[in-house]
Interface confidence: medium
Amino acid sequence: AGIVIPQNPECPNTGDKNFPQNVKINLNVLNRKTNSRRASDYHNRSTSPWNLHRNEDPERYPSVIWEAKCRHLGCVNAEGKVDFHMNSVPIQQEILVLRRESQNCPHSFQLEKMLVAVGCTCVTPIVRHMG
Amino acid sequence: AGIVIPQNPECPNTGDKNFPQNVKINLNVLNRKTNSRRASDYHNRSTSPWNLHRNEDPERYPSVIWEAKCRHLGCVNAEGKVDFHMNSVPIQQEILVLRRESQNCPHSFQLEKMLVAVGCTCVTPIVRHMG
């Protein structure tokens, strides 16, 4: 899709290098309930199962983030055994969080990027042949 | 880990119901390069492969978000055929984005939650057996 130019020419596009560095944020979160059906058992039923680890930081918003760690190097086969001809690998996602700029904290935050593992998937290993 | 109390008692905890609704954000993003190894081929090498679809919105930050769509209902077996005894399912992650509050846009944004599919994993269907 082509870039839609905002109606007010003084408003730079959010993808632009001129996007304002200091903005006011309303933290009444839109879509507070994203209403997803909780896929709470995928991490156990996957052929590349994972455990969820709680990452907590009170100086960050959101303060709790769950991170996935693959249980095995290989993948679970139909017999329930770990097959090392395949690999369990984390699927990572870059997310935005808000970080308090200083401990004496007037309502001032810094946007921060975090790389989190959301779950795991089973992949065929890369086999390089010589010659 | 226990909650760390911010040093200034006037600063509510970011996980708290009293977290400020209007804050100032510095958009000089920390960790701009999260230095992830680009898992660009997992989507093809996975037993539950996926395609990545570009979701673009100039009124949002980040303006481009990539969404995963599983290629198959089943999973790819060792012979490269789709096996319907297993299911490819999307792994979803709730992320925060910034949404411009109005078209005439003084530097005012709203925090918004989005549910995005990051990749796919292969799971065993729920078949409940008794006894």
């Epitope: 997803s36 059906r37 | 996926w50 599983c70 299911n87 599919a117 078949v127 409940r128």
Partner: antibody, heavy 120, light 107 residues
Framework: EVQLVESGGGLVQPGGSLKLSCAAS????????MSWVRQTPDKRLELVAI????????YYPDSVKGRFTISRDNDKNSLYLQMSSLKSEDTAMYYC?????????????WGQGTTLTVSS | DIQMTQSSSYLSVSLGGRVTITCKAN??????LAWYQQKPGNAPRLLIS???SLETGVPSRFSGSGSGKDYTLSITSLQTEDVATYYC?????????FGSGTKLEIK
Amino acid sequence: EVQLVESGGGLVQPGGSLKLSCAASGFTFSSYGMSWVRQTPDKRLELVAIINSNGGSTYYPDSVKGRFTISRDNDKNSLYLQMSSLKSEDTAMYYCVRCHYDYERVFDYWGQGTTLTVSS
Amino acid sequence: DIQMTQSSSYLSVSLGGRVTITCKANDHINNWLAWYQQKPGNAPRLLISGSTSLETGVPSRFSGSGSGKDYTLSITSLQTEDVATYYCQQYWSTPFTFGSGTKLEIK
């Protein structure tokens, strides 16, 4: 309450085309696989098409493959079935069906159906 | 394709009685079997999945059993509201086929 309401059925000549629609409500549409199942005049049930929750993957039995296309619009909570090169054996009641939990094989909620008649 | 055979097209049972509806696959389906009930003029309704697991809201007088190729749906203490056609469906192998149905009537 889960509701599935089909529309778009009618009388079509052999070789013709038709698009069925289904409006879903009462559940998080974007979280479920959806399907079309038809019931022939002799009351036999036959799976026609399945689409997964985010629309990324589909399945068709050989009887309709290449002629029917299932699609969905999660923003509109709608499911569609585009049918072309219709044959008399496609005459049936077409049900819009929600797939059970997270595996697209078992069908837990059914609409009331819309009738397709293929005849010259 | 896996064929699902419901040998009885019709069954006539007394009120309060017990009925067993059978479904046979021409290959192993490893308990990946569902049962549906269709009352006259209505759409089908899922009763059981995984050959034995009752769906929420289904009365406990319904039960499923079986393994391998052979499966049964049992209804104890038959009620008038149980008058319907019952279909089995295998979901072990595409194209996830249905049986031809067994119509239950009251004697």
